[in-house]
Amino acid sequence: DAEFRHDSGYEVHHQKLVFFAEDVGSNKGAIIGLMVGGVVIAC
């Protein structure tokens, strides 16, 4: 269930906001990747 987020707090697919502050932690996207020449390559 890949969801890509704008910095605004919107999710691209359905524009659902993180409305309640208590949900901030559970809606942070984890970034797992390898830095190669200044570019992050997803692993």
Epitope: D1, K16, F19, F20, A21, D23
Partner: antibody, heavy 112, light 112 residues
């Protein structure tokens, strides 16, 4: 498209019970806190229950504490409100809300 | 609970003229992430509330740019640059920084 659809409202006698349901779609339901908000005729918005994303924490105002129970089934993308020992003053339109999105509301009328 | 106080409670407006609603919270709405979770809703007669402005100053999807929000800490303002006929209804400020979610009393905007 985000949608919240309530059901289960109706006419009930004082002291009776009702169970409201809210079917959610268009977003990852399990990641978001949800609430039930009511509005008595001609009045403002009143939160009656709030539940966190995983269902481990709930909040009720004193007006409904001990009588109402909020729960959720994240596998079914559904929010519930069990209402017991209903009183005339519980008469209102009940909305399911994720904050940014609200359902159409379901009318609960408590009367003999 | 965080108490939200709106003023005025009734606002007669002239079409094409600006309008402003104030909202004050009983405690700071700044969350640990640096954001204030202060929002504005509009409820038109017979409809569910709909989100206009989220996190103080961000217009929600589809909201006209004549609506703007500002403020910080405990004092916030909603402004309509030029009121249109479709803007009539009850405006609510709301905070979701702290549990429980709380609402202002509502400001009824009507055309003079």
């Amino acid at each position: 498209e985000v949608q919240l659809v309530e059901s289960g409202g109706g006419l009930v006698q004082p002291g009776g019970s009702l169970r409201l349901s809210c079917a959610a779609s268009g977003f990852t339901f399990s990641r978001y806190s949800m609430s039930w908000v009511r509005q008595a005729p001609g009045k403002g918005l009143e939160l009656v229950a709030q539940i966190n994303s995983v269902g481990t924490s709930t909040y009720y105002p004193d007006t409904v504490k001990g009588r109402f129970t909020i729960s959720r089934d994240n596998a079914k993308n559904t929010l519930y409100l069990q209402m017991n020992s209903l009183r005339a003053e519980d008469t209102a339109v009940y909305y399911c809300a994720s904050g940014d999105y609200w359902g159409q509301g379901t009318l609960v009328t408590v009367s003999s | 609970d965080v108490v939200m106080t709106q003023s005025p409670l009734s606002l007669p407006v002239t079409l094409g003229q600006p309008a402003s609603i104030s909202c004050r919270s009983s405690q700071s709405l700044i969350y640990s992430d640096g954001n204030a979770y202060l929002h504005w809703f509009l409820q038109k007669p017979g409809q569910s509330p709909r989100l206009l402005i989220y996190k103080v100053s961000n217009r929600f999807s589809g909201v006209p740019d004549r609506f703007s929000g500002s403020g910080s800490g405990t004092d916030f303002t909603l402004k309509i640059s030029r009121v249109e006929a479709e803007d009539v209804g009850v405006y609510y400020c709301s905070q979701s920084t702290h549990v429980p979610w709380t609402f202002g009393q509502g400001t009824k905007v009507e055309i003079k």
